[in-house]
Interface confidence: low
């Protein structure tokens, strides 16, 4: 009979009866016996616990007791394992991935690690980073394409581009958050002054001395004024877009009423204040008659000029 | 004190679109924080729609990914919901959320805005 | 999806007493879960989160505990404040909430 099994040298585990190593080695092919792994080691379905087997090739599995590493000895900063097991065996390879802006250390936005038999192959990396940013009517004085959290990275204005009040170089910060800004730089003659004033209006911010090309500045109309056009007006190629304007309102005082012997109809305001487009209503005054038809009673109110009725 | 404050209308009219905005105050919207919507339809629990970094970058509920589009406007410190094609299963309070990040993927909500109502109806 | 169940659906319990609110979930999510109460016509309050740190501002009669599947919610002594909607919330793998239990008065 055929003795193909010795008896069984286990590393990080054992038999659960070594006192069976007279009596039954070498094993015949066919027997199975029960072991155990230490700790931080696992049997090949996981357990900590399971059957040695003897084949005509040997002892199976041929490794009993494997490897194991832990989730909670990973440290990652600004990145995440998405597996939710907390146990891996060896040779496992686990991926992680880095939060929006950071990067491996090769520039991927995901790595992976591996359990080996000391533990897991290194820690993950996942480093702040900023790209090459896009840059217009100017240049980067570095080759770079990525940069490091807190990384300056300078640049320069092509010839007649300018970034504000004469400056022709700038530098931005990668940050937390990205790049402290864009870097762009503008047609000297693109940018604009203040934006006009308008009568009876004005602006709803403080003005500056010079806009950047596509900057907007909000208009608003004072009291009783009706503003006409947009309330934005927009910087490009160096010019304002037509700014709104604030049409009069009518104002009908009692003065021109008496002028005209005639008072408003359903009201006894001594001044009233009208928009362009609406309709006031008028009567004779007690003892005065209407010279001309009762429609002539209803004046419209245009860009602040209405034209009375009259009562003799 | 970061505060949350949703806005948008309260009533949508079934295969309409759900529009609602999420402002932001007392703190930057480009925090590294990731900025959430959930809703509660009446007289249940919660449930998670999506979430959105100040860079764009998106997360959706599997479940609701086809109709919703999370975007973010940085000018105006504040992050805004479309859910399309909205039938009666949509009603409910609909609230944002800011996640309070730590060292993990994602966190549990720490703030949240007070929520508002939004009925599907014709 | 990872389901999350909590039980039970109601929970009645003199003031005074202690709660104990549990929540399973459908596979391990670690430590990654949170607690929340949510008053009638108010939006959930965070309570706890990593299974076991409470919030800022959070009573200490508050604790959670649990790895994994299993979760507790311990409300040592309680306060008529206390009465409210529990929900657990999993951010392992997305973020999904359990269907919550009601804590009230008994």
């Known amino acids: 009979e055929v003795k193909p099994c010795d008896f069984p040298e286990i590393q990080h585990g054992g038999l659960y009866y070594k006192s069976l190593r007279r009596l039954y080695f070498p094993a015949a092919a066919g027997q199975s016996y029960s072991y155990y792994c230490d700790q931080n080691f696992v049997t090949p379905s996981g357990s900590y616990w399971d059957y040695i087997h003897c084949t005509q090739d040997g002892w199976s599995p041929t490794v009993p007791c494997l490897r194991t590493c832990s989730k909670s000895d990973i440290e990652i900063e600004n990145g995440f394992i998405s597996e939710s097991s907390s146990i891996y065996i060896l040779n496992k390879e686990i991926q992680y991935k880095c939060k929006p802006g950071y990067a491996t250390a090769d520039g991927n936005s995901s790595g992976s690690i591996t359990c080996l038999q000391n533990g897991w192959s290194a820690q993950p990396i996942c480093i702040k980073f900023c790209d090459m940013p896009v840059f217009e009517n100017s240049r980067a004085k570095s080759n770079g394409m990525r940069f490091k959290l807190h990384d300056t990275l300078d640049y320069e204005c092509y010839d007649g581009y300018e970034i504000s009040y004469g400056n022709t170089t700038g530098s931005i910060v990668c940050g937390e958050d990205g790049w402290s800004h864009f870097p762009t730089c503008y047609n000297s003659s693109e940018k604009c002054g203040p934006p006009p004033p308008i009568s009876n209006g004005d602006t709803t911010s403080f003005l500056l001395k010079v806009y950047v090309p596509q900057s907007r500045v909000e208009y608003q109309c004072q009291s009783y004024y009706e503003l006409q056009g947009s309330n934005y007006v927009t910087c490009s190629n160096g010019e304002w877009s037509e700014p709104p304007r604030c049409i009069h309102p009518c104002i009908i005082t009692e003065e021109n009423m008496n002028k005209n012997n005639i008072q408003l109809k359903g009201k006894s305001d001594i001044k009233y204040y009208a928009k362009t487009g609406d309709t006031i209503e008028f009567m004779c005054k007690l003892g005065y008659n209407a010279n001309t038809s009762v429609l002539s009673f209803q004046a419209v109110c245009r860009e602040g000029i209405v034209e009375y009725p009259r009562c003799e | 004190q970061v505060q949350l404050q949703e806005s948008g209308p309260g009533l949508v009219k079934p295969s309409g679109t759900l529009s609602l905005t999420c402002a932001v105050s007392g703190g930057s919207i480009s925090s590294s924080n990731w900025w959430s919507w959930v809703r509660q339809p009446p007289g249940k629990g919660l449930e998670w729609i999506g979430e959105?970094?100040?860079?764009?970058?998106?997360n959706y509920n599997p479940s609701l990914k086809s109709r919703v589009t999370i975007s973010v406007d940085k000018s105006k410190n504040q992050f805004s919901l479309k859910l399309r094609s909205v039938t009666a299963a949509d009603t409910a309070v609909y609230y944002c959320?800011?996640?309070?990040?730590?060292?993990?993927?994602?966190?549990?909500?720490?703030?949240w805005g007070q929520g508002t109502m939004v009925t599907v109806s014709s | 999806e990872i389901v999350m169940t909590q039980s039970p659906a109601t929970l009645s319990v003199s003031p005074g007493e202690r709660a104990t609110l549990s929540c399973r979930a459908s596979q391990s999510v670690s430590s990654n879960l949170a607690w929340y109460q949510q008053k009638p016509g108010q939006a959930p309050r965070l309570l706890i989160y990593?299974?076991?740190t409470r919030a800022t501002g959070i009573p200490v009669r508050f604790s959670g505990s649990g790895s994994g599947t299993q979760f507790t919610l311990t409300i040592s002594s309680l306060q008529s404040e206390d009465f409210a909607v529990y929900y657990c919330?999993?951010?392992?793998?997305?973020?999904?909430f359990g269907q919550g239990t009601k804590l009230e008065i008994k």
């Open positions: 959320a800011r996640d309070q990040l730590s060292s993990g993927p994602t966190d549990a909500f720490d703030i």
């Open positions: 919330q999993q951010y392992d793998n997305w973020r999904t």
């Open positions: 959105i970094y100040h860079s764009g970058s998106t």
């Open positions: 990593g299974a076991s």
